[in-house]
Interface confidence: low
């Protein structure tokens, strides 16, 4: 088993955002395992009345890119690309504020879904953030 490697995305749940691009995985079994988790989470989300349209438009692709991060093609070793911190913060604090509060207090959701913690992401001006995955969230003025 490798320490982490890049492989084409083979799933369905996030195919419309990722296609068959290369994603970073930590073990051979990880992609299938995460696919099962995110499929279950999206099923829960789909039946929930707690998700607004303005949130889901960007939250779903963001969760997909967090679960299946693109490989950093600029790196000589397999490495995941981070989400962009500025977009993460707008998603959490503006577009999906109510939904995040609900999700973080709901063990059933947390069991199935890994929510990115924006504090863990590189600062926007840092070198590590130069190649972050941008979802296309409109920036607040």
């Amino acid at each position: 088993e490798e320490d982490g490697f890049c492989q084409p995305y083979r799933g369905i749940a996030c195919a419309r955002f990722i296609g068959n691009r290369t994603v970073y995985m930590e073990s051979l079994h990880m992609q299938g395992e995460i696919e099962n988790q995110i499929t279950a989470a999206f099923t829960m989300i789909g039946t929930s009345s707690h998700l607004s349209d303005k949130c889901s438009q960007f939250a779903i692709p963001s969760l997909c890119h967090y679960a299946f991060p693109y490989c950093d093609e600029t790196s000589s070793v397999p490495k995941p690309r981070d989400l962009c911190r500025d977009e993460c913060e707008i998603l959490e604090n503006v577009l999906c504020q109510t939904e995040y509060i609900f999700a973080r207090s709901n063990p059933m959701i947390l069991m199935r879904l890994k929510l990115p913690n924006c504090e863990d992401l590189p600062q926007p001006e840092s070198p590590e953030a130069a190649n972050c995955i941008r979802i296309g969230i409109p920036m607040a003025d």
Epitope: S27, M30, E33, D82, K114, D120
Partner: nanobody, 111 residues
Framework: EVQLVESGGGLVQPGGSLRLSCAAS????????IGWYRQAPGKQRELVAR???????YYADSVKGRFTISIDNSKNTLYLQMNSLRAEDTAVYYC?????WGQGTLVTVSS
């Protein structure tokens, strides 16, 4: 940003036991996998054990049956229980979550 801090290393005799801890400054339950690596002097860093968010564990062949990885999400802490230690287990042990690393804790197995 999240900080990972390892502890529990030290000097132990062959056949002895140690329990390493990795405390995180934020929740580690959101990571899809978190694990332990080690680097012996003059050697490359290698994966020792990993646990996924669904509880699946992976162990390097050299530690199977001797080491046990576990996680306590309520304490934001990852553990590595190391039994029947051997001289070849001597290394700096690192906690890892995706591309985040701790500073390492030294384990020395010697009589």
């Amino acid at each position: 940003e999240v900080q990972l801090v390892e502890s529990g290393g030290g000097l132990v005799q062959p056949g002895g036991s140690l329990r390493l801890s990795c405390a995180a400054s934020h929740s580690i339950s959101r990571f899809y996998a978190i694990g332990w690596y080690r680097q012996a002097p003059g050697k490359q860093r290698e994966l020792v054990a990993r646990i996924s968010s669904m509880g699946r564990t992976y162990y390097a062949d050299s530690v199977k049956g001797r080491f046990t990885i576990s996680i306590d999400n309520s304490k934001n802490t990852l553990y590595l229980q190391m039994n029947s230690l051997r001289a070849e287990d001597t290394a700096v042990y690192y906690c890892n979550a995706r591309n985040l690393w701790g500073q390492g804790t030294l384990v020395t197995v010697s009589s």
